[in-house]
Structure formats: C-alpha cells, structure tokens
C-alpha cells in the first residue's frame, strides 16, 4: 500500500521525519494500492479508461481488474525503460472490447495473461505475437488464460469467433512455449483444427462449458506434453476412433468429459469400449446418456454392444408420409 | 504517520544473545522490505541485511551471516533482529530502516538500539 | 565488494561558502544516494538517484555524477548544514556505504 506521510516526533526510539511529505516520492500509481515486497500492483474495480503510465518498474504481479478500458492499443504496457520484471498481468472484467495488435509488446517477462470476462469483439491476430512476420519472436508466455470472453451477439463480427481467437494464437507461431491455455465458457462450435499443432508445449487445456459438438476434426496428436484436458459442459455426442488413439497415445493425459450429451446409439459402442479399457478419462463412471430417450441417464460403463442399436434407416420406397 | 520504533538501549555480557524490535506504524510492514544497518560508535554506517516480509526471504552482508538473524511478525507489523555470541565489538547502535525497491534506498529510520557488550 | 571512498574525511566552511564533497566508487554504479546524520539522530535520506532531493531537504543542496565519481554540493553553506554525509550504493551486494564526510562550520 501507499505510505503515508510522516512528521517529525521527539518520543524516544522513534524515526524523525524531515518534513510532512514523505521523504521519497510515493511510486503507486494514483488509485492503485502497491507492495513492493509482494512486487505487486492492484489497480482493482477503479473505473479506469487506460493503463496508468507511472507503473513501478519492481512490478512482477499487475492486477487491473474490474474496470473500464475498452480498448488496449499497441505498446499498452511499453515504458522507457521497460517493465522487464512484469510476469503475471490480470485484466479480467474490465470492460475490454478491443486488443489491438502488439498490445503485451515490450514485456519480456511476462508469463501468465489473464483476459477473462472481457467481451472481445476485437482480438488482433497480433495481440499476443507483437508482429505480423510468418514467425515472429517467441512470445514469453506459459500461461494464457481466455475464459469468457464472447462478446454478445450483437458485438460480433462478420468473421466466426473461433476463427478470431485461433488466428491470435496461431500468428508467428509466437506461443509455441505455452503451457495453459483456458478457454471456457466461450460458445465455441468447434475448434479450428490448425491450433493446437501450433501449441505443442500444451500441458493444460479448458475447454469446458462451450458448444462443441464433435472432436473430428481436431488433432491432438502433436500434444505429448498434455496433461490436462477439460471438455465437461460441451454439446459432444460422440468420441470417435480416431479421436480416442490420439487420446490414448497422449502419454501423461487426463481427460474431463462430464456433463455431455452423449447419444448412446450405434455410433457410441467404440467409445463405451474404449472407456471400459482406458484410465485416460478422470470421473468414467459419471458418464452417463442423454440420448436416445430410452437410454437417458444410463451409465456409459454399464453399457453392452446389445444396448447400442441404431433404428435402421428405411429405403425411401418404405418411408411412410 | 510512517514510524519506526525500535526497542530500549541494551547492556549484555559477552557470549550472551540478544533480540531487539522495530515495531511500524503507520504502513503494512508486509509491504516492504526492511533493512538493518549498524554504527560503531563514531564510526561509519555498515548494511547487515535485508528481508521481504512478504515472502520472508533474507539477504545478508556476507560480514553478519551467522552473527545477525533477520525475522518479522506480520500481525505485529513488527521486524526482528537477532544477534548472538556478541562480543565487544559488536557494542554499536543498531538501526531499521525501510527499504524502497523502486529507489534502492531506505527511506524512514527507526532511532537506533544502542547495544553495549561488557562484562 | 563496492568500496565508497569519500573525501575529505572532514572539512570544514564559512557560512556563504560553496561545499563540494565527492564519493568515489570502486565498482561503477548507476545510482548514488546520499545520506545526512546530525549527532546522535538516525540518519535521513538526503539526495536519492544521485541528483534529486529528499522531501524537505533545501534547495541549495545539489548532487551529480556518474559511474564511479560522485558528488555533493551545497551552494552556500549555513550552520544548520553541520552533519556528517555519506553517501550509499543500494545496487550490489552488499549495499555499501562512504566512510562519510563531517561537514563543521567556521
């Protein structure tokens, strides 16, 4: 916290003061609170419109939460000279539409971002790599967190959202040291496949409560360092062959499907086997079937090949009006 | 109002250790870190270490490891300074001092413990 | 370990007089602060990064320098400047301080 000003004071053992003012300039920023042990600035629920300019440059942990900036434009945390011990900056909830390109640029250490709970009907391709160069220089961050931040319907662009997001962590190959990466609560309807090839330090994964229906097109094969990977709270009907070797071949993986609305048909009986088989999957024995009606609320372990039938589809010379 | 007040002038005999105080007020001692120095009598200023009470990290002047231990207690905003198997020459007065990270300098003083060594 | 020279060790001036004091570094520092102790007080922060003044500390106190040479002036001396200054380097381990300058009046 900010100190306080002093005075002068005869009362044995105790510090005199020059004067009123503090001896040393106060580095807070004004409507911040500092700890220079904690190496710690917390600018939290204050209304602000902009980044202050006057951070310290001892600053390893920046909180800027709960306000109203709106938009972060490129060079948003640069300083002469640089806030080179900056490590972890927060700026969930603070009204951000808009990360302009180059925004964490100048930041040399920072390793954990958290920009959850901001609306972003704007994310640069170059938010996170600085550049717009095929492959730019390594980003230093592990630890990306983007719970979220969907903006509403009405603030989208014409582009999908997925695509928006992907590109940013896709440009420069700049994340290839990433290794969190959370991205829930997104609306997502699918994962754009070309993203986590990109990510290949990826250790933890979030994607819980979006709407991603199938994992078909997604490869986690590049992924050996997983070991956590969160899709409870999705629209996922089925895990397919493909999908379930690549999770099999991860060799530190554990996966979290809960709360999905599997359909216990036909197309489920190499899922139940795999799942029968596996230890990949944390919590198995929640799983349960949401479809077909018949089979609602059945256990997925408890499953046999005779419980998964298909109706058969009818020539259409037999379909009845 | 920033202040730091240090425990009463001291007289032990050599061997002996002792523990003195420097109690804040004023600001969370958590905040910052805090420094000790020393002054032989009429002579100059000697750094004898430093510690984060936030993280209770120490960093001592080479010169005081093993003489000088540094501790604080956060709920009594208060930092510590042990000194053991004194000797004669450790009779100084001994100062706190709060250390500003953006400045690399202290900024308040405590008054000083005047600590005598004689038998 | 940085050894602070300061010199002279003592000095006296007239009321009105210019006072120059210096600190020489053995190891280049990019920062000097200076220090200010009156007999039996605790010292108080007087120049901080090299040239700029503590809260309260008059303004015909100045500081400057760079690299291992630093100094302290003080435009035109008076009584209430009687002190010793030391200066101070808070960079490298350990933090060192000058042998001091004992400043008395004429």
């Known amino acids: 916290t900010s100190s306080a000003s002093s005075s002068s004071s005869s009362a044995p053992f105790l510090a005199s003061a020059a004067s009123a003012q503090p001896p040393l300039p106060d580095q807070c920023p004004a409507l911040c609170e500092c700890s220079e042990a904690a190496r710690t600035v917390k600018c939290v629920n204050r209304n602000l419109t902009e980044v202050p300019t006057d951070l310290p440059l001892y600053v390893r942990n920046l909180f800027l939460t709960g306000n109203q900036l709106a938009v972060l434009p490129a060079g948003a945390f640069a300083r002469r000279p640089p806030l080179a011990e900056l490590a972890a900056l927060n700026l969930s909830g603070s009204r951000l539409d808009e990360v302009r390109g180059g925004a964490f640029e100048h930041l040399p250490s920072l390793r954990q971002l958290d920009l959850s709970h901001n609306p972003l009907a704007y994310l640069s391709p170059f938010a996170f790599s600085g550049s717009n160069a095929s492959i730019s220089a390594p980003s230093p961050l592990v630890e990306l967190i983007l719970n979220h931040i969907v903006p509403p319907d009405d603030k989208r662009q014409n582009r999908s959202f997925e695509g928006m997001v992907a590109a940013a962590l896709v440009a420069g190959r700049a994340l290839q040291g990433l290794h969190l990466l959370e991205l829930a609560s997104n609306h997502f309807l699918y994962l754009p496949r070309d993203v986590l090839a990109q990510l290949p330090s990826l250790r933890y994964l979030d994607l819980s409560n979006n709407s991603l229906v199938s994992l078909t097109y997604v490869s986690f094969r590049n992924l050996t360092h997983l070991e956590s990977l969160h899709l409870e709270d999705n629209a996922l009907k089925v895990l397919h062959n493909g999908t379930l070797a690549e999770l099999q071949g991860l060799p530190h993986v554990r996966v979290f499907l809960d709360n999905n609305p599997w359909v216990c048909d036909c197309h489920m009986a190499d899922m139940v086997t795999w799942l029968k088989q596996t230890g990949v999957v944390q919590g198995k024995d929640r799983l349960t079937c949401a479809f077909p009606e018949k089979m609602r609320n059945r256990v997925l372990l408890e499953l046999n090949s005779a419980d998964l039938d298909c109706d058969p589809i009818l020539p259409p010379s037999l379909q009845t009006s | 109002e920033v202040q730091l007040r240090q425990s009463g002038p001291v007289l032990v005999k050599p061997g002996a250790s002792l523990k003195m105080s420097c109690k804040a007020s004023g600001f969370t001692i958590a905040d910052y870190y805090m420094t000790w120095v020393t002054q032989s009598h009429g002579q100059s200023l000697d750094w004898i270490g430093l510690?984060?009470?936030?993280?209770?990290?120490?960093t001592y002047n080479q010169k005081f490891k093993g003489k000088a231990t540094l501790s604080v207690d956060k709920s009594s905003n208060t930092a510590y300074m042990d000194l053991n198997s004194l000797t004669s020459e450790d009779s100084a007065v001994y100062y706190c001092?709060?250390?500003?990270?953006?400045?690399?300098?202290?900024?308040?003083w405590g008054r000083g413990t005047s600590v005598t060594v004689s038998s | 370990e940085n050894v602070l020279t300061q010199s002279p060790a003592i000095m006296s001036a007239s009321p009105g007089e210019k006072v120059t004091m210096t600190c020489s570094a053995s190891s280049s520092v990019s920062y000097m602060h200076w220090y200010q102790q009156k007999s039996s007080t605790s010292p108080k922060v007087w120049i901080y990064?090299?040239?700029k003044l503590a809260s309260g500390v008059p303004g015909r106190f100045s500081g400057s320098g760079s690299g291992n040479s630093y100094s302290l002036t003080i435009s035109s001396m008076e009584a209430e400047d009687v002190a010793t200054y030391y200066c101070f380097q808070g960079i490298g381990y350990p933090y060192t301080f000058g042998g001091g300058t004992k400043l008395e009046i004429k």
């Open positions: 001092a709060r250390w500003r990270l953006g400045y690399y300098a202290m900024d308040y």
């Open positions: 510690i984060n009470p936030y993280s209770g990290e120490t």
């Open positions: 990064d090299t040239s």
